[in-house]
Amino acid sequence: SAPFSFLSNMTYHFIRIIKHEFILNDTLNQTIIRANDQYLTAAAIHNLDEAVKFDMGAYTSSKDDTKVPVILRISKTQLYVSAQDEDQPVLLKEMPEIPKTITGSETNFLFFWETHGTKNYFISVAHPNLFIATKHDNWVCLAKGLPSITDFQILENQA
C-alpha cells in the first residue's frame, strides 16, 4: 500500500464550491456512475441521467502551492469521495457538512486538481503519487497510471 503522505500534517481551509453539477468522462468516453451504494464505476451509458453529478469545493493550504486542493461531493447529497490505497476503490463517505478545515487522516477527502488543456487529473493529497482512475470492468480507484485511465473530461451544466 502507498505510504501515508508527508502532507498529512498540513491544514487545508475550505474556500468555496467552485464547480456545481458536473459529470466526469474518461478518455474511453466512459462516464462515472454510482454503483453498489458506496462505490463508483465508469461505464459507457446511453442515458446521461445515470451519470453522477459532482460538486467541487476548493481549499487553501498553509503552504503556498500552485496545485488546487479540492473535495468532490455528489451533488445535492452529503456524500464525499474518499481515497483508500493504491488499486483500492475510492469510497463514498457521508459527512453532515463540508469540512471547514481538513488535516491528518481527513486528507483522504482531498485531491489536487490539475488541468492540461481539456484533461483533468485528481491526485490524492494523502497519496501524492496516486490519481483517481478508471479501469476496464472495475471500480473507480487510486492508481499511478496505465493500464488505469487517470485523465478526465469535465462536462458542465448537463441538463
Epitope: A35, D49, S75, T77, L79, W139
Partner: antibody, heavy 122, light 107 residues
C-alpha cells in the same frame, strides 16, 4: 438486453424455508446492488432489503431481520433470497430488482425479475 | 423511516381523460421520487425517476412533477393499456419506502 430471471413457484408448509434465485444477464453483475421486494396478494410493495453484489454485504428491513438471508453466486451472476420459519402471512410474490442511482443520488429499481410466487399452506 | 402517502387509493377514468395521482412524503425528499407501473400479474416497471424524468422508452403521455414533500404523477390522455396500479417510491433515504399504490381502472 438486461434480464433478471427468477426461479419457479414454490409451495411450502408453515415453519419451512424457501430459497428463491434471481439470475442476472446483460450487465456487469457486481456493479449494481440487488433488492428483494415482496407483494402479498392484493397488497403493496414491501422492500425486504438489499445486497451489495461486490462485497456480499446485506441490509435487511427490520420486519425481516433474523428470518431472511441474501446470498450470491458471482460466478453465475445469481442472487438468492432465503426466508425461514415461514408462516401463512409470507404467502406473496417475491421480486428481485436491480439498483440504480440516477445522478448519483436518486435510488431507484430499474429492472425487475418476473416474480416468484411462494404459497405457505398446511 | 420516511412515510409515503399516495392518493387516491383507486380511481376510475375514461379513455382520453387526464389522470392525476399524488404522493406525499413525511419529510423533504429533494425530488428523489420515482413512479412505477404494475400491470396485473406482472412485475413493476420504472416509469419516472427524480420526480420528473421519463425513463427512456416510456410514452410521453406520462409525466411527473413536484418538489419538497409533494409530488404528482399525470397521464395526459389515458389509454386502455394504462390500466395498472401505480406506486411512488422515495429514493432519498433507506429503506426507500413505497406508497401504498393507486389502482387505475377504465370507466
Amino acid at each position: 438486453e438486461i434480464q433478471l430471471v427468477q426461479s419457479g413457484a414454490e409451495v411450502k408448509k408453515p415453519g419451512a424455508s424457501v430459497k428463491v434465485s434471481c439470475k442476472a444477464s446483460g450487465y456487469t453483475f457486481k456493479y449494481y446492488g440487488m433488492n428483494w421486494v415482496r407483494q402479498a396478494p392484493g397488497q403493496g410493495l414491501e422492500r425486504m432489503g438489499w445486497i451489495n453484489t461486490y462485497t456480499g454485504e446485506s441490509r435487511y428491513a427490520d420486519d425481516f431481520k433474523g428470518r431472511v438471508t441474501f446470498t450470491l453466486d458471482t460466478s453465475t451472476s445469481t442472487a438468492y433470497m432465503e426466508l425461514s420459519s415461514l408462516r401463512s402471512e409470507d404467502t406473496a410474490v417475491y421480486y428481485c430488482a436491480r439498483d440504480i442511482y440516477y445522478f448519483g443520488s436518486d435510488y431507484a429499481m430499474d429492472y425487475w425479475g418476473q416474480g416468484t410466487t411462494v404459497t405457505v399452506s398446511s | 423511516d420516511i412515510q409515503m402517502t399516495q392518493s387516491p387509493s383507486s380511481l376510475s377514468a375514461s379513455v382520453g381523460d387526464r389522470v392525476t395521482i399524488t404522493c406525499r412524503a413525511s419529510q423533504d425528499i429533494s425530488n428523489r421520487l420515482n413512479w412505477y407501473q404494475q400491470k396485473p400479474g406482472k412485475a413493476p416497471k420504472l416509469l419516472i425517476y427524480y420526480a420528473s424524468r421519463l425513463k427512456p422508452g416510456v410514452p410521453s403521455r406520462f409525466s411527473g412533477s413536484g418538489s419538497g414533500t409533494d409530488y404528482t404523477f399525470t397521464i395526459s390522455s389515458l389509454q386502455p393499456e394504462d390500466i395498472a396500479t401505480y406506486f411512488c417510491q422515495q429514493g432519498n433515504t433507506p429503506p426507500y419506502t413505497f406508497g401504498q399504490g393507486t389502482k387505475l381502472e377504465i370507466k
